[in-house]
């Protein structure tokens, strides 16, 4: 008789793959053309990505450092209208991508969140989130927190608006902090909130200190579900050396959570890599024309136009990386274990039931080295098989699909390999 | 057939400079990194520098910090050594070397070398 | 002073079976870095004859073998032959010195 099924967890639609963050409309579309009927037509793209949700904006007004002057139920006119703003939730709709309304109050001036003012901002944002709820967005994020007085307790509260409203509605906080303890506090308040922390950029961005850093968060936060980033709200290149970007996409896609990216960071933006351009939000490269100032200033390989027509490229590697995370079903709500291997490695399976199982090796070193993966780590449901199939490497070089002798494995410098094999009763 | 032929080598005085070139072919060079190591009369090999495959990797041993500086032209499929400052414990045969792909970061394919002489 | 070490040399009889023992430290062969052995004939560049522990490439004869335990490592050469009179080198890297790591050689010698 075959083994019964493992039942399958509740699934929102923020555990079925990646959040795209458009902190800055004008940057993301290109010079001057930045509002939200643009965005409309930028709809296809983000489904090329397979990504499940926007989180967009701020969009509303507010005069620098100025409360009266900020309102978060008006959008701001350079932004479009909020007839524009409905019309792109339709349209996003159709295409299954959700839109989380980032609602940062005074995100054009010094401090987010009017410090001398906290109680009257709390009222404003409460009210924001039931209109906006009303008009139809299915979530909002929030920044800066660590800069919000009482913010356990505000959230609490916001968190019950949303969730009222409905189960299907996402919270997102960010923080600037990488503290382990004061990340786990602002969670503890708030059961379904997802935070963004600068917690994985505190690193010496090798295996060992990755490992240690994935699995303390883990232990830390029980069971509850997680999201990955390296910031809330900054660019991959502007935290990791270039050579370990690709690792990094593969780690955000295969760990157990959510995985958060900026707009850019699927084809390596880089912040202020042009001159010109301001660091917190430099323009996304979409052609060679993107950036007309300094002709010649942008090569082919640089833009969404020359990677898409490259194989080998960042952005081919996130959205293949994109499309396993939102249909198998070990990285969708898999269990996850890590083992020991080689020096500057961290390695781990990602495994649901009777499904096809994922391990993921990862090489954060410049030295190419014999993966030494030890199986005796692993518990009985997890055990390693002598051979399996390469799914992807983050480097060209290897066929994709060949089945590799895991005794033998060997990963080049900054190398990541995900492979794929079954369960065996 | 994987080749890799050094020249630039000679007889140079203490505190003088030398840069020895690596023409590399029969592969691509552009996706390989690359090493130099060297040799003194009658001795054992000794590891001096390593550079990534597009150059913006590069470590050198502490014998040689801050006096050799290793660089690559992928378009001209060639590698190059810098030594300035050279001391009479620089005499020895430079060896350009592949670090292969797949076997653990070990040295697969070297040159024929380069006889680096430091003498007054 | 060389990082790993090798005894200077070694001799046998042909036909005969030598080993050549490669030893480090936990922050090089002990610590999980791979290694490799490399043959120098006489008067001629170095050529890799086993990497990553125990892996030998294409057109290296099966009577060379090596493998690796804890902070050492072993190069075996059985059905000694004229022509494998030669030095042999193990290599590593080490963490320490963020650098790649010779053995000072050994002269094999075959009787």
């Known amino acids: 008789r075959a083994p019964r099924c493992r039942e399958l967890p509740a699934q929102k639609w923020w555990h079925t793959g990646a959040l795209y963050r458009i902190g800055d409309l004008q940057a993301f579309q290109g010079h001057g053309s930045g509002n939200l009927a643009g965005l409309k037509g930028r709809l296809d793209y983000l489904s090329s990505l397979k990504v499940k949700g926007l989180v967009l904006g701020p969009l509303h007004k507010n005069q620098k450092d100025d409360v009266a002057q900020t309102d978060l139920l008006q959008i701001d006119p350079n932004f479009g209208s909020k007839e524009d703003f409905d019309n792109l939730l339709q349209s996003a709709k159709k295409k299954s991508i959700r839109v989380i309304l980032d609602l940062t109050p005074n995100y054009r001036g010094e401090n987010l969140w009017f410090s001398t003012q906290v109680d009257s901002v709390a009222t404003k944002v409460k009210d924001a989130l039931e209109f906006w709820l009303q008009a139809g967005v299915d979530g909002f994020q929030v920044r800066d927190i660590e800069n919000l007085k009482d913010a356990s307790s505000f959230l609490a509260e916001w968190e019950n608006i949303t969730k009222g409203f409905s189960e299907d509605r996402l919270l997102i906080a960010g923080t600037n902090s990488s503290d382990l303890q004061q990340i786990v506090s602002l969670l503890e308040s708030n059961k379904d909130l997802l935070l963004t922390s600068s917690y994985l950029s505190d690193s010496s961005f090798t295996g060992e200190h990755t490992k240690s850093l994935v699995t303390q968060y883990l232990n830390a936060t029980g069971n509850r579900w997680c999201s990955w980033s390296l910031s809330q709200a900054g660019l991959l290149t502007s935290f990791l050396p270039a050579q370990l970007l690709r690792l990094y996409q593969l780690m955000l896609f295969t760990l157990p959570g959510t995985p958060v990216f900026s707009y850019g960071d699927e084809i390596g933006l880089k912040a202020a890599a042009l001159p010109g351009q301001p660091v917190e939000a430099p323009v996304m490269l979409w052609d060679e024309s993107s950036f007309p100032d300094i002709p010649g200033a942008v090569s082919a390989n640089m833009t969404v136009k020359g990677q898409s027509e490259d194989p080998g490229s960042l952005l081919s590697l996130f959205r293949q990386l994109s499309d396993q995370r939102s249909k198998e079903r070990s990285l969708l709500h898999g269990d996850f274990h890590t083992f020991s291997s080689g020096p500057g490695l961290f390695s781990y399976i990602r495994h649901w039931d009777q499904n096809e199982r994922f391990l993921v090796v990862l090489n954060f070193g410049d030295v190419g080295l014999s993966a030494g993966l030890q199986a005796s780590d692993l518990p009985a449901s997890a055990s390693l098989p002598t051979k399996a199939d390469l799914v992807l490497s983050t480097q060209p070089g290897r066929e994709e699909g060949s089945p590799l002798e895991l005794e033998r494995l060997k990963l080049e410098p900054h190398e990541g390999l995900l492979l794929r094999f079954p369960y065996v009763a | 057939e994987v080749q890799l032929v050094e020249s630039g080598g000679g007889l140079v005085q203490p505190g003088g400079s030398l840069r020895l070139s690596c023409v590399a072919s029969?592969?691509?060079?552009?996706?390989?990194?690359m090493h130099w190591v060297r040799q003194a009369p009658g001795k054992g090999l000794v590891w001096v520098s390593r550079i990534n495959s597009d150059g913006s990797i590069i470590r050198y041993a502490d014998s040689v910090k801050g006096r050799f500086t290793i660089s690559r032209d992928n378009a001209k499929n060639t590698l190059y050594l810098q030594m300035n400052s050279l001391r009479a414990e620089d005499t020895a045969v430079y060896y350009c070397?592949?670090?292969?792909?797949?076997?653990?970061?070990?040295?697969?394919?070297w040159g024929q070398g380069a006889l680096v002489t430091v003498s007054s | 002073q060389s990082v790993l070490t090798q005894p200077p040399s070694v001799s046998g009889a042909p036909g005969q079976r030598v080993a050549i023992s490669c030893t480090g430290n936990n922050s090089n062969i002990g610590a999980g870095y791979d290694v490799h052995w490399y043959q120098q004939l006489p008067g001629t560049a170095p050529q890799l004859l086993i990497y990553g522990n125990s892996d030998r490439p294409s057109g290296v004869p099966d009577r060379f073998s090596g493998s690796k335990s804890g902070t050492s490592a072993s190069l075996a050469i059985t059905g000694l032959q004229a022509e494998d009179e030669a030095a042999y080198y193990c290599q590593s890297y080490d963490s320490s010195l963020t650098g790649w790591v010779f053995g000072g050689g050994t002269k094999l010698t075959v009787l």
């Open positions: 029969g592969f691509t060079f552009s996706s390989y990194w």
């Open positions: 070397v592949r670090e292969g792909r797949y076997t653990g970061s070990s040295l697969d394919y």
